[in-house]
C-alpha cells in the first residue's frame, strides 16, 4: 500500500522581498526519500527540476533553487512539488516573491528580506494539481 505523502513546504532565503539584482534561493522541503523536487510558477508554464536533494534532518529532505540576479519578471507566486517513488506529492502553498528597486523608493514594499513578517503563503489550488516538464540543475533563472 502506498504511503500518504506530506505536502512540501517552500521558503525563500534571505527573504521574500528581494532588491533588484540581488540573489534569492527557494528552499523546498519534504520527507526523506524524495527523488525529484520541482519548482513551479503560478501563471507561467515554466518550471525547474532538481535531483540534487540533501537531507536537512533525520526526517526531512530539501532542495534549493537559486536565482543569482533577480529581475522584475521573477516576482510572483512559486510552489514546490516532489516525487517520491512511485508518486508525486500534492503541491505546497504558494510563496509570493516581491522584487523592489535597489534604491528603496516610496513604492517599495515595507517588508525587508529576512524581516519578521515572513514569507507570504497562499493556498495552492490542488483541485487542478497538474502542469508538467523538467530541466535539470539548481538555477531557477528560466522561471522568469
Amino acid at each position: 500500500q502506498e504511503e500518504d505523502l506530506p505536502r512540501p513546504s517552500i521558503s525563500a532565503e534571505p527573504g521574500t522581498v528581494i532588491p533588484l539584482g540581488s540573489h534569492v534561493t527557494f528552499v523546498c522541503r519534504g520527507p526523506v526519500g524524495v527523488q525529484t523536487f520541482r519548482l513551479e510558477r503560478d501563471s507561467r508554464s515554466t518550471y525547474n527540476d532538481t535531483e540534487d536533494v540533501s537531507q536537512a534532518s533525520p526526517s526531512e529532505s530539501e532542495a534549493r533553487f537559486r536565482i543569482d540576479s533577480v529581475r522584475e519578471g521573477n516576482a510572483g507566486l512559486y510552489r514546490c512539488i516532489y516525487y517520491k517513488p512511485p508518486k508525486w506529492s500534492e503541491q505546497s502553498d504558494y510563496l509570493e516573491l516581491l522584487v523592489k528597486e535597489s534604491s528603496g523608493g516610496p513604492d517599495s514594499p515595507d517588508t525587508e528580506p529576512g524581516s519578521s513578517a515572513g514569507p507570504t503563503q497562499r493556498p495552492s489550488d490542488n483541485s487542478h494539481n497538474e502542469h508538467a516538464p523538467a530541466s535539470q540543475g539548481l538555477k531557477a533563472e528560466h522561471l522568469y
Partner: antibody, heavy 115, light 111 residues
C-alpha cells in the same frame, strides 16, 4: 522517443486501446497529450495525462475516451468508436522546463472505424 | 471551453517574403501557448513555445510574440521548405481548466 501503437481497422462500437510508449526518458516527469487528425483535417486535442497523475479531456472526448498511465506507457482507450473517430492518433511529450510546448511527437497510429 | 481563433486560414507569399499568422484566445492563457508546423504525412513539429521561445533547431526566421489572449507567428525570409500548415495550441492547465485546444490551422503556400 515516444511511439504510438494499437491502431487498426475496427467496426463501430468495438473498444480499442492505443498505447504511447516512452523510451530514453523518465515518463514520471512529463505531461503526455493525445491528439488526433482525421484525413485532410486539422489537429484535434483529445486529452492529457499530467506528470502528477491528473487526467484532462477535451469536452467532446469526455465519456468517449479514457486516458491512463503506467511507469512507461500512456494509454488511450476508445470506449465505443464511431466512423467519425477515423484518424491518425498522435501522442506527444512536453519540452524540458516548460509545459507549454510539446517537442517530442510519435509518428502516429492510424485508426479506421468502418462497418 | 477555450477557443483559439487562427487567421488567416491560408496565405500565399513569395520566397524571401514575410508571413504573419495570428491566434486569438477566448480567455487569457498566460504563457501556455505554442506554434507548430506540419507537413503532409508528418507529425507536427514544435516551432515556438512559451510563447516566444524558439524550439531547438528552429531558425530565427520564425518569431513568436504576444501574451494573454493575442499571439502572433511571423516567418521572415520565406523559403520553399516553409510551405506547410501551421497550428497554434494552448496547453493551459490552471485554476480553471482551459487546456489543450488547437487553432484551425493556416496553410502557407510559397510562390
Amino acid at each position: 522517443a515516444v511511439k504510438e501503437s494499437g491502431g487498426r481497422l475496427v467496426t463501430p462500437g468495438t473498444p480499442l486501446t492505443l498505447t504511447c510508449t516512452a523510451s530514453g526518458f523518465s515518463l514520471y516527469k512529463y505531461n503526455i497529450q493525445w491528439v488526433r487528425q482525421a484525413p485532410g483535417k486539422g489537429l484535434e486535442y483529445i486529452g492529457a495525462s499530467t506528470y502528477a497523475g491528473y487526467t484532462y479531456y477535451a469536452s467532446w472526448a469526455k465519456g468517449r475516451v479514457t486516458i491512463s498511465r503506467t511507469s512507461t506507457t500512456v494509454d488511450l482507450k476508445m470506449t465505443s468508436p464511431t466512423t467519425e473517430d477515423t484518424a491518425t492518433y498522435f501522442c506527444a511529450r512536453h519540452i524540458d522546463g516548460d509545459y507549454s510546448g510539446y517537442a517530442l511527437w510519435g509518428p502516429g497510429t492510424l485508426v479506421t472505424v468502418s462497418s | 471551453e477555450l477557443v483559439l481563433t487562427q487567421t488567416p486560414a491560408s496565405v500565399s507569399a513569395a520566397v524571401g517574403g514575410t508571413v504573419t499568422i495570428k491566434c486569438q484566445a477566448s480567455q487569457s492563457i498566460g504563457t501556455w501557448f505554442a506554434w507548430y508546423q506540419q507537413k503532409p504525412g508528418q507529425s507536427p513539429k514544435l516551432l515556438i513555445y512559451g510563447p516566444s521561445k524558439l524550439a531547438s533547431g528552429v531558425p530565427p526566421r520564425f518569431k513568436g510574440s504576444g501574451s494573454g489572449t493575442e499571439f502572433t507567428l511571423t516567418i521572415s525570409d520565406l523559403e520553399c521548405a516553409d510551405a506547410a500548415t501551421y497550428y497554434c495550441q494552448s496547453t493551459y492547465f490552471g485554476v480553471d481548466y482551459l487546456g489543450g485546444t488547437f487553432g484551425g490551422g493556416t496553410e502557407v503556400e510559397i510562390k
